[in-house]
Every structure is written in structure tokens, then in C-alpha cells.
């Protein structure tokens, strides 16, 4: 049986972008019928992790781990009901708590999204490593990046494969 | 505020293996009281991440990520109540699923591993990357690191970092 | 508009290597993943590698995974496709293609015949 | 890896004939599906992208549908240039790969 999975596609892309395999975030990006704008912005993300090398791939893989399994994402305000648990904690959706640390990864300061980052991991390697890709992704992408990476962020969270 | 994650040593400890880190192996294994043979065992494991480069550090991630954000993760079989969702799901503790990938890592045979897997990634390139590092870990560890690795993790999943 | 050509096929003994070469104008090359698809003699389709745009990631088929090796010079608007360890089945017209989005074979190039056979 | 069957393997059709080609894969593939025709002694030429998207330049004759595991190629009025081999591929993921072909002609 495969299991159900909270918003494979984003995963699919997260990794794809940290792993730095072009050819699998093309492909991924043809998923949700990403345009050439958001592709380009995509590919300047994934320019940063690997700049940066395999620690800040590894060291990101850990805190989207870290994020994920977090008691955030695990249901969100304990729900009052199963029923509810049921429609708001188990479905596809993504995890509220991953969309606010990407939102911030794009459209906040660098301080913002280590702080946001330091609620789930603390250890100081791992938060350098994330302002060096939030300062790298700051000065590679331009505001029209930025908007273009947000736009493919939404054709993700509502694609059918999410 | 510092969130609260399930069993952050753990995934300290995996990401450390994964990413070929071994200070920070070492500095995880103290943390947890790790004797000389099971920073052995742990360390053969490393070996395994090592040697099959990059591509197996970033897919175990994301596999790691995927069973972490699974249904199976995020309420086990929707207890009947909100306390017990309180009690079993929102906790620190290792997700059941994690738990029995790991178990199969060490002690099934490859195709039992990879079948798992494959419940929550069924990417060729994941299972077969799967496969790579079980053999590995197969041909590297002898019973007894396999058995200093499994009271190794006991320790991880018994103690208060957990 | 688009043209891919494909050149340095050729008769090759088992064990043997050979390099493709691939042309391409008409277009960004850089801009587009590539892909080598093959078709043995009264035979139907087998994908064979892609490639990225920029930088080149690779992916290939488990048939001539270790054996083939694929790259790109992107100021020469070039593909490669080296292949080495050659065997009998490896027989086939080999085609370069653009790959739209990595995803769809939207331009082919016309084939180079490779034969293996002692 | 993802197997994709096609059926029929050959088939005769009369011009003006509506003509019906099925793909199946043996696992979800989503709409991840191209449709190519190759005529005798030339290279493939896609017609559909993801399952029914007409690529530019091709006749609107040609339609795909289908989603999932099963799919549908359709020539709503087959044309004497329409005489070749009809392929399906998926691109859930690494590796691609073809349907077995189906070889179109004219009675």
C-alpha cells in the first residue's frame, strides 16, 4: 500500500532544489506546469545550495525534517474534535508551520527566518547555514524572482499532487 | 519560543550519519552516553553515506522526511479521543513508522527495507539508493555492531533529549 | 527554427567505445534539458539519457548506467554521448532530442546509426 | 520502473475511419503522458503532451485523454499521412520509459 503523503510534489521540489539535480527540478516544475519566470527563480535557489556545498543540503534536509515532524505540523493546535484532527491534521495539505518558513525564506529578513528556523533547531551550524542561503537567495534573486518563486509555491500547494 | 519536535536527538544523530559529519556524530553519541562499540556501529553506518556520495545523503533525507511527514506520523490510526491524540501523537517520541524503517535498516533484509520504503517514496531512484545502502550496512556490520547499534538507539529513543 | 544533428555513429566491436555528437541551433541551448533516445533495428523506443540546461545533471537508463557517459558544451551548442563497453544489443539508430521541461521530446534530430558485431 | 503496454500492436482503418489507441501503465502516473508518431524511415514527432495537450503545429484530429493508468490516443478521421507507428511515454520520473508501439495503416 502507498501511503498518503503530506504535499509530495513540494518535497519532490524542496529536494530536487537542495540536491542540486537540475534535471529532476525541471522535471517537477513540469508537474505543476511551472512557468519560464519560475523556473529561472527556482534555479536561483538551487544556485545557493550548491554554492554553498553539501553541508548547507544536508543541514536544510534537517530542518525540513526537523519542521515536518515538529508537533506544529503534527496537528496544529490539537483540534478539538477527531473529526476535525481528521480534515485538518491528516490530509495532503502542507504543513502551515513549512509555508510560514519558506514565505519567510523569500519574502523576510535575514533575521526573521533564522529566528523562525531556531524554533525548531537551534544548533548554531545549522543556523549559520541558514542565513549564508537566506543572504545568498537575497542577493541572487530580484524582487520579480521573488514574486515568480511565490507564484510556483501556490501552483504547488493547490496542484492535485499536493 | 522553542518548539517542540519528536525526538530531536534522533534526527541529530541520523543527520550526522547522513551528512559524513563525524564530529558531530561524536558530540550526539556523548549526549546520549554511547558506548565505544555502539559509536563503532554507528560509525560503519556513516561509512555506508560516505561512500555512496551526495545522492544517497540528500534521497535518505528525503525519505526521512517523507515517512516523517506521513499520515502514519501524524496520527497512527486516528485514536478515538483528543486525549489520547494528546498523549500519542503530539508527544516528543519517535513516530512508530520511523522506528520500524530503522529496525528494518538493521536487521531485515534488503528487500523488506526497500519494500518499506517504498510505501512512502516509490521514486526508482530512491529504492534504488535504498537498496545500495542496506547491502552496504549488510556487508560492513558484523551481528554484534548491528546489536550495539539497536541498544544505541534504545538509548536514543529512552532518553530525556528525546 | 530548431535542427539537432546527430553525427559519429559507425560499425564497432563488442567491448568497443564510440562518441556521439550532437548540433544543435535554431534555439537557447542553454536553456533546454537534452535527451538521447534510441531504437534497435524493427524495434519501438528506448529513452537513453537526459541531461539538465545550465549545469548538466545527468540521469540514464539502468541498461547503460556506468557505461555511457553524457555532457554538453553549451558555447559550442553541443551534446556528447560517449559510449564504452559496447555490447550486441547496444545496436540501435541513437536520436538526440530537446526535452521540453525535461518532461517532453519536442525536437529530434534525424539519427546516427551505431552497429556492434564482431 | 514504471511498464507502459499499448493496445492494439497493429491495427487497418479505412480513411475518414475514427482510430483508438489505449496506454496503460502499471502504476499511477498522474496525467505524466506524450503521445509521438513515427512514420516509416524518419525520426518520432510529439503530437500530445501531458495526456491531451495538443503540441503547437499539430492537427486537431489528434486528441489524448486519460489519467491515472489508462489512457486513449485518438485520430477522429484517419488521413493517408496519418500511416505509422503511434508510441506512449510517461515521465512520472526517471527512468522514461515507452509503450511497445502501435502500428497504424491504412486497409
Known amino acids: 500500500v502507498k501511503m498518503a503523503e503530506t504535499c509530495p510534489i513540494f518535497y519532490d521540489v524542496f529536494f530536487a532544489v537542495a540536491n542540486g539535480n537540475e534535471l529532476l527540478l525541471d522535471l517537477s516544475l513540469t508537474k505543476v506546469n511551472a512557468t519560464e519566470p519560475e523556473r529561472t527563480a527556482m534555479k536561483k535557489i538551487q544556485d545557493c545550495y550548491v554554492e554553498n556545498g553539501l553541508i548547507s543540503r544536508v543541514l536544510d534536509g534537517l530542518v525540513m525534517t526537523t519542521i515536518s515532524s515538529s508537533k506544529d505540523c503534527m496537528g496544529e493546535a490539537v483540534q478539538n474534535t477527531v473529526e476535525d484532527l481528521k480534515l485538518n491534521t491528516l490530509g495532503r495539505e502542507i504543513c502551515p508551520a513549512v509555508k510560514r518558513g519558506v514565505d519567510l525564506f523569500l519574502t523576510g529578513t535575514p533575521d526573521e527566518y533564522v529566528e523562525q528556523v531556531a524554533q525548531y533547531k537551534a544548533l548554531p551550524v545549522v543556523l549559520e547555514n541558514a542565513r549564508i542561503l537566506k543572504n545568498c537567495v537575497d542577493a541572487k534573486m530580484t524582487e520579480e524572482d521573488k514574486e515568480n518563486a511565490l507564484s510556483l509555491l501556490d501552483k504547488i500547494y493547490t496542484s492535485p499532487l499536493c | 519560543v522553542k518548539m517542540a519536535e519528536t525526538c530531536p536527538i534522533f534526527y541529530d544523530v541520523f543527520f550526522a550519519v547522513a551528512n559524513g559529519n563525524e564530529l558531530l556524530l561524536d558530540l550526539s553519541l556523548t549526549k546520549v552516553n554511547a558506548t565505544e562499540p555502539e559509536r563503532t556501529a554507528m560509525k560503519k553506518i556513516q561509512d555506508c553515506y560516505v561512500e555512496n556520495g551526495l545522492i544517497s545523503r540528500v534521497l535518505d533525507g528525503l525519505v526521512m522526511t517523507t515517512i516523517s511527514s506521513s499520515k502514519d506520523c501524524m496520527g497512527e490510526a486516528v485514536q478515538n479521543t483528543v486525549e489520547d491524540l494528546k498523549l500519542n501523537t503530539l508527544g516528543r517520541e519517535i513516530c512508530p513508522a520511523v522506528k520500524r524503517g530503522v529496525d528494518l535498516f538493521l536487521t531485515g533484509t534488503p528487500d523488506e527495507y526497500v519494500e518499506q520504503v517504498a510505501q512512502y517514496k516509490a521514486l526508482p531512484v530512491v529504492l534504488e539508493n535504498a537498496r545500495i545502502l542496506k547491502n552496504c550496512v549488510d556487508a560492513k556490520m558484523t551481528e554484534e555492531d548491528k546489536e550495539n547499534a539497536l541498544s544505541l538507539l534504545d538509548k536514543i529513543y529512552t532518553s530525556p533529549l528525546c | 527554427e530548431v535542427e539537432l544533428l546527430e553525427s559519429g555513429g559507425g560499425l564497432v566491436q563488442p567491448g568497443g567505445s564510440l562518441r556521439l555528437s550532437c548540433a544543435a541551433s535554431?534555439?537557447?541551448?542553454?536553456?533546454?534539458?537534452m535527451s538521447w533516445v534510441r531504437q534497435a533495428p524493427g524495434k519501438g523506443l528506448e529513452w537513453v539519457s537526459s541531461i539538465s540546461g545550465r549545469v548538466g545533471s545527468t540521469h540514464f537508463a539502468d541498461s547503460v548506467k556506468g557505461r555511457f557517459t553524457f555532457s554538453r558544451d553549451n558555447s559550442k551548442n553541443t551534446l556528447y554521448l560517449q559510449l564504452s563497453s559496447l555490447r550486441a544489443e547496444d545496436t540501435a539508430v541513437y536520436y538526440c532530442?530537446?526535452?521540453?521541461?525535461?518532461?517532453?521530446?519536442?525536437?529530434w534530430g534525424q539519427g546516427t546509426l551505431v552497429t556492434v558485431s564482431s | 520502473d514504471i511498464q507502459m503496454t499499448q493496445s492494439p500492436s497493429s491495427l487497418s482503418a479505412s480513411v475518414g475511419d475514427r482510430v483508438t489507441i489505449t496506454c496503460q501503465a502499471n502504476?499511477?502516473?498522474?496525467?505524466?503522458l506524450n503521445w509521438y508518431q513515427q512514420r516509416p524511415g524518419k525520426a518520432p514527432n510529439l503530437l500530445i503532451y501531458?495526456?491531451?495537450n495538443l503540441e503547437t503545429g499539430v492537427p486537431s484530429r489528434f486528441s489524448g485523454s486519460g489519467s491515472g493508468t489508462d489512457f486513449t490516443f485518438t485520430i477522429s478521421s484517419l488521413q493517408p499521412e496519418d500511416i505509422a507507428t503511434y508510441y506512449c511515454q510517461h515521465y512520472d520520473n526517471f527512468p522514461f520509459t515507452f509503450g511497445p508501439g502501435t502500428k497504424v495503416d491504412i486497409k
Open positions: 535554431g534555439f537557447t541551448f542553454s536553456s533546454y534539458a
Open positions: 501531458a495526456a491531451s
Open positions: 502504476q499511477d502516473i498522474s496525467n505524466f
Open positions: 532530442a530537446r526535452s521540453r521541461g525535461a518532461a517532453y521530446f519536442d525536437y
